[in-house]
Amino acid sequence: NWVNVISDLKKIEDLIQSMHIDATLYTESDVHPSCKVTAMKCFLLELQVISLESGDASIHDTVENLIILANNSLSSNGNVTESGCKECEELEEKNIKEFLQSFVHIVQMFINTS
């Protein structure tokens, strides 16, 4: 359920507020609907960077749970093949705040277009 993914993103944003994490993350800020699965996979990969950089058990557990939920939601969409989409490394690098903002936006796109 994508709303549960949103819940975990809110938890992560609450948890990182008191931390200073300098990492920049590959961020898709303008997702074409026909590339949303590819973009989501990039977000999930980059999310693990936040988990590692924070060194925080609560963040690690929340990220782990979020990835499981998101992968379950993606698999329920069936095996979608997308072509002509950007590789993760081609995306713009943004700070954590902007990354999470764009992450919420793409999850909302999955909800809105389901």
Partner: antibody, heavy 119, light 108 residues
Framework: QVQLQESGPGLVKPSGTLSLTCAVS?????????WSWVRQPPGKGLEWIGE???????NYNPSLKSRVTISVDKSKNQFSLKLSSVTAADTAVYYC????????????WGQGTLVTVSS | SSELTQDPAASVALGQTVRITCQGD??????ASWYQQKPGQAPILVIY???NRPSGIPDRFSGSSSGNTASLTITGAQAEDEADYYC???????????FGGGTKLTVL
């Protein structure tokens, strides 16, 4: 600075169709944002009507869904609202608004236009 | 009935602090945004996300969230803060946007 401007008839007859357009300037309707219509009956609170993404995806308030159509015209940088089978209860100030990226918000609003349903 | 509940009215003495609340189960998943609306005017976004203020919004406005409740706090209320305040978020399905019923703030 993004600006939104609603236009359309201020008076609609009962059982008729309310039609409004929102012209977007200072920004592109083909941005990553969703675009919404919100209304406010006189002396009452705000009610979300529905939203559209420039690829044509729409979501509507379940209580209005059977009567609402929102469409987008990228060439004119505008989006439109149609509300059918109107009654006096649909009399309200109608606002168009741009949704922010990420967490729910409306970061830009039109000034609003009063639509009265009366014969 | 609205999925977001606000008290209809609140008051604050000039220069004092007031907190306006918004309750709803959906706020466990989503942050709320807050709008100020004065008579005859369109709403203005004052807080969005965790606690973000759009440019031009005074820093006396702040937002917070705990459990199923979101709060808007005005620290050192001014006469010009007298207005209606609405919270906004998504519903439990995530598909629909919803507003609270609004809180009329009077500055005494």
């Amino acid at each position: 600075q993004v600006q939104l401007q609603e236009s359309g008839p201020g008076l609609v007859k009962p059982s008729g169709t309310l039609s409004l357009t929102c012209a977007v300037s200072g920004g592109s309707i083909s941005s990553s944002n969703w675009w919404s219509w919100v209304r406010q009956p006189p002396g009452k609170g705000l009610e979300w009507i529905g939203e559209i993404y420039h690829y044509g995806y729409t979501n509507y308030n379940p209580s209005l869904k059977s009567r609402v159509t929102i469409s987008v015209d990228k060439s004119k940088n505008q989006f439109s609202l149609k509300l059918s089978s109107v009654t006096a209860a649909d009399t309200a100030v109608y606002y168009c608004a741009r949704e922010g990226i990420g967490w729910p918000s409306f970061d830009y609003w039109g000034q609003g236009t009063l639509v009265t349903v009366s014969s | 009935s609205s999925e977001l509940t606000q008290d209809p009215a609140a008051s604050v003495a000039l220069g004092q602090t007031v907190r306006i609340t918004c309750q709803g189960d959906t706020l466990r998943s989503y942050y709320a945004s807050w709008y100020q609306q004065k008579p005859g005017q369109a709403p203005i976004l004052v807080i969005y996300g965790k606690n973000n203020r759009p440019s031009g919004i005074p820093d006396r406005f702040s937002g917070s969230s705990s459990g199923n409740t979101a709060s808007l706090t005005i620290t050192g209320a001014q006469a010009e803060d007298e207005a209606d305040y609405y919270c906004n978020s998504r519903d439990l399905s995530g598909k629909n946007l919803v507003f609270g019923g609004g809180t009329k703030l009077t500055v005494l």
